[in-house]
Interface confidence: medium
Amino acid sequence: KRFHDVLGNERPSAYMREHNQLNGWSSDENDWNEKLYPVWKRGDMRWKNSWKGGRVQAVLTSDSPALVGSNITFAVNLIFPRCQKEDANGNIVYEKNCRNEAGLSADPYVYNWTAWSEDSDGENGTGQSHHNVFPDGKPFPHHPGWRRWNFIYVFHTLGQYFQKLGRCSVRVSVNTANVTLGPQLMEVTVYRRHGRAYVPIAQVKDVYVVTDQIPVFVTMFQKNDRNSSDETFLKDLPIMFDVLIHDPSHFLNYSTINYKWSFGDNTGLFVSTNHTVNHTYVLNGTFSLNLTVKAAAPGPCPPPPPPPRPSKPTPSLATTLKSYDSNTPGPAGDNPLELSRIPDENCQINRYGHFQATITIVEGILEVNIIQMTDVLMPVPWPESSLIDFVVTCQGSIPTEVCTIISDPTCEITQNTVCSPVDVDEMCLLTVRRTFNGSGTYCVNLTLGDDTSLALTSTLISVPDRDPASPLRMANEFDYKDDDDKLEHHHHHH
């Protein structure tokens, strides 16, 4: 059998195989050693007994999508049946005090591969034997501790395969410079040691995507916005847009990235090299936000000029490139800075990413302030309580609810939360009455809200000990002290 007979039904064309050569991978036309690595079709009864105690599940993930030319990393994690895990020596053991259907196991081992390898025969002086080989016959690499690696992973994509010896979790990175754009399939077959041969335990496949577009995501944040995920924001308050470029292999690390913004409100185009930008919409309505991200990335060099005779061009990735330039220095003195310009790469190409969103701008509560706090007269039966009126103003739209959260002086441990609907006039002036049980310093968070916005102000308030001899007190106003955006209110007792 050949690798492609074993590993997958999908056969890429000769053109695809030729133009998608992966560095360090081998052609799936190679022969597969079926004696050492038996091949079982889906539904074969032997799968049931391929692992003691149940089936092993392999989970394949990747950091796709990958910008063409960057590295894409695939990770395979094996999930063992309940109560089983891999120990430090690579053996599979039962977890202590863990019950599965078979109850508690007397034998600590599911698979004791250390013991198997110690009494294994037929080895030469290097620890190499006829069975310590991959399916294509290549010997296992002898890293330190390789004997503790008891799983063989065979990755297969684009008519090529890659073999890896590993533990219950492995990672493989592939450079995508020669990979055709679009979705591709990665298949992985996993074998375990079984004496001097191997047994298949899991198969898994996943789609990955190679793209010539920079994968771009934009997060949007605005103070007082009640729901940041609904793409509805408030007029007259800055929105912070933060661009996240999906570049897990840091392919664009040496690139200068330009961000070109159009906010859709006739403010024109804004270009920045910073991934964050603030923009304030001054009108209500629906606006189309457009972002173009541009980066000069390492790319393929242009093909050499064709010979003068007419010939049919061969399609290649270069035909999709928007622009490319060689950075090979010219004669001395031609360009004094050329050598220092782009490290490690001779050719560059402009790559683009796009983001579009429709955002809705509405009125909202822009600001809330406590302008006065008044100690309210309390009747005798509640000597331990203080009643305080907060006079609050706001700007922007009219709130429909008010909440006060009373907490400890650090503003971290909530003691009491009260929310109530409010009916406020156009001037947005309201009085909020709250009870404080006992003396001490309290943190008061006061929020005003409507359907789309939530505005907050915080203050520290100091409530003194009550004088039981004073059944009635006159209302007193508090003194104000500005303290780093928090108002410190001293409650004087007369």
């Epitope: 200068t256 090299t273 928007k322 622009s323 004094p336 800075l337 560059q348 402009n350």
Partner: antibody, heavy 122, light 106 residues
Framework: QVQLVQSGAEVKKPGASVKVSCKAS????????MGWVKQRPGQGLEWIGA????????NYNQNFKGRVTMTVDTSISTAYMELSRLRSDDSAVYFC???????????????WGQGTLVTVSS | EIVLTQSPSSLSASVGDRVTITCSAS?????MHWYQQKSGTAPKLLIY???NLASGVPSRFSGSGSGTDFTFTISSLQPEDAATYYC?????????FGGGTKLEIK
Amino acid sequence: QVQLVQSGAEVKKPGASVKVSCKASGYTFTANWMGWVKQRPGQGLEWIGAIDPSDSFTNYNQNFKGRVTMTVDTSISTAYMELSRLRSDDSAVYFCTRSGYYGSPKLGGDYWGQGTLVTVSS
Amino acid sequence: EIVLTQSPSSLSASVGDRVTITCSASSSISYMHWYQQKSGTAPKLLIYSTSNLASGVPSRFSGSGSGTDFTFTISSLQPEDAATYYCHQWNSYPCTFGGGTKLEIK
């Protein structure tokens, strides 16, 4: 060797437009941004904007927005800067400068044109 | 925009003197460039990326600094160094230049 050669001096009336050219030679024209800088008599340097000749991606200083247009003709390795609705304070020398390789901020303007004097007078 | 404040705005020094010009940025930047401009000519790049000497520029010119504070130094002033010197940043749009330092030889 690298050279940037600009068009000759211009005299314009207020409200008119002027288009200054900058012909590049001695390097791959599309590999570097082309910047434009204004210098009024006896004054300092003011950045007008820049264009990437590989895709005509432009970036203008807000102070000139709506009045400046930068273009390129890659077939003749030439960059253009057009300034419209001219005012008397637009009287200045305008320089083109070859700027960062692929927009890299690590590099300044390593080559400059000789400058084009634009006089705006009624 | 990032404002570059150059000081001094003018200075007079003798041949052989060590001359230092500073450039302060209103926000932190990664790279500063320095130019020399003589009357009636285009600016000439002397230092790029804060401390790299442009090709053909004498080694008496140097640059240093990081963040918001950058320095340009002429270790031993020569008669041909009489000119106006500008700092320049292209870390953030719009690119900006310092106001210039006019250097005269006594």
